[in-house]
């Protein structure tokens, strides 16, 4: 039975040209995290395997930095980066947990971080 929950940074906004940390956290389970995949719609951004380290998709390699932790830092933001991002936690023995983050990249300097929220 899957008992865990994914806590994410929720709805966040950032300035064009700036950077943002995409972060998820798996709690309420003793399952072992074997890998975390970061995806944007149908695009793979990065994979962090607990033993094999990081894979960064070549289309993002100049703008994505691994970490902190299992998170992902997205740099040199453009308006086109606005959209949904998913952290997909592959765990043993529970299986897969998915968290969602919505990022809005703003032209202006008025960018505020949203509240954290949980996805069961």
């Amino acid at each position: 039975m899957m008992t865990g929950t994914i806590e994410t940074t929720g709805n966040i906004s950032a300035e064009k040209g700036g950077s943002i940390i995409l972060q998820c956290h798996l709690s309420s389970t003793t399952a072992q995290v074997t890998q975390v995949n970061w995806e944007q719609q149908d695009q793979l951004l990065a994979i962090c395997n607990a033993d094999l380290g990081w894979h960064i998709s070549p289309s993002f390699k100049d703008r994505v930095a691994p970490g902190p932790g299992l998170g992902l830092t997205l740099q040199s933001l453009t308006v086109n980066d606005t959209g949904e991002y998913f952290c997909i936690y592959h765990t043993y023995p529970d299986g897969t947990y998915t968290g969602r983050i919505f990022l809005e990249v703003l032209e202006s300097s008025v960018a505020e971080h949203g509240a954290r929220f949980q996805i069961p």
């Epitope: 890998q35 995949n37 149908d42 695009q43 793979l44 994979i47 607990a50 380290g53 894979h55």
Partner: antibody, heavy 119, light 107 residues
């Protein structure tokens, strides 16, 4: 120039073990993971597992877990794969392979080591 | 485990022809797919990574496409030296898995 030099062919008896080496050169050994791939009948490829030479962390294909052991010797920049309790199904060519920088695709391969299990 | 299916074990083509080799994943693997060429008696050689990126030094007649579950490897104009087995591989999730291989034969 990156090179992965594997040990020579092996003829072993059923039930025995084999240990294959993969000596690397031309890059910083601890900065890249090393993987092992089995090829049976000259066609099908199977990922056995990979090892992070920096910290010794390993990831195994469940099919080989318990029978395969991946190790490294950082001082000689050499990776090893030991396979135990061999049967005729283990007769194959075994490759070591190194992925790219922040990329899991395997861009450098050893020349392969042929293992024949026969009584 | 994710199963990678290359439906054609053999493909016969002529020099100058365009050929498409397909690979289907049993579940979505985004763009985490590589293609390898293996000539007789040699080790596999990386041609395409992340579904559509050509590896350094690979001729531009080789291209890859696809996302999710369906992937295609294309040789736009087959040369005699392209006689080989072509393997797809997913690295979306361990265990990394390969297709059964497609042997390209030149008529």
């Amino acid at each position: 120039e990156v090179q992965l030099q594997q040990s020579g062919p092996e003829l072993v008896k059923p039930g025995a073990s084999v240990k294959i080496s993969c000596k690397t050169s031309g890059y910083t050994f601890t900065e890249y993971t090393m993987h092992w791939v089995k090829q049976s009948h000259g066609k099908n490829l199977e990922w056995i597992g990979g090892i992070n030479p920096n910290n010794g962390g390993t990831s195994y294909n469940q099919k080989f877990k318990g029978r395969a052991t991946l190790t490294v010797d950082k001082s000689s920049s050499t990776a090893y794969m030991e396979l135990r309790s061999l049967t005729s199904d283990d007769s194959a060519v075994y490759y070591c392979a190194r992925p790219g920088w922040y990329n899991y695709a395997m861009d450098y391969w050893g020349q392969g080591t042929s293992v024949t299990v026969s009584s | 485990d994710i199963v990678m299916t290359q439906s054609h074990k053999f493909m016969s083509t002529s020099v100058g022809d365009r050929v498409n080799i397909t690979c289907k994943a049993s579940q979505g693997v985004s763009t985490a797919v590589a293609w390898y060429q293996q000539k007789p008696g040699q080790s596999p050689k990386l041609l395409i990574y992340s579904a559509s990126y050509r590896y350094t030094g690979v001729p531009d007649r080789f291209t890859g496409s696809g996302s999710g579950t369906d992937f295609t490897f294309t040789i736009s104009s087959v040369q005699a030296e392209d006689l080989a087995v072509y393997h797809c591989q997913q690295h979306y999730i361990t265990p990394w898995t390969f297709g059964g291989g497609t042997k390209l034969e030149i008529k």
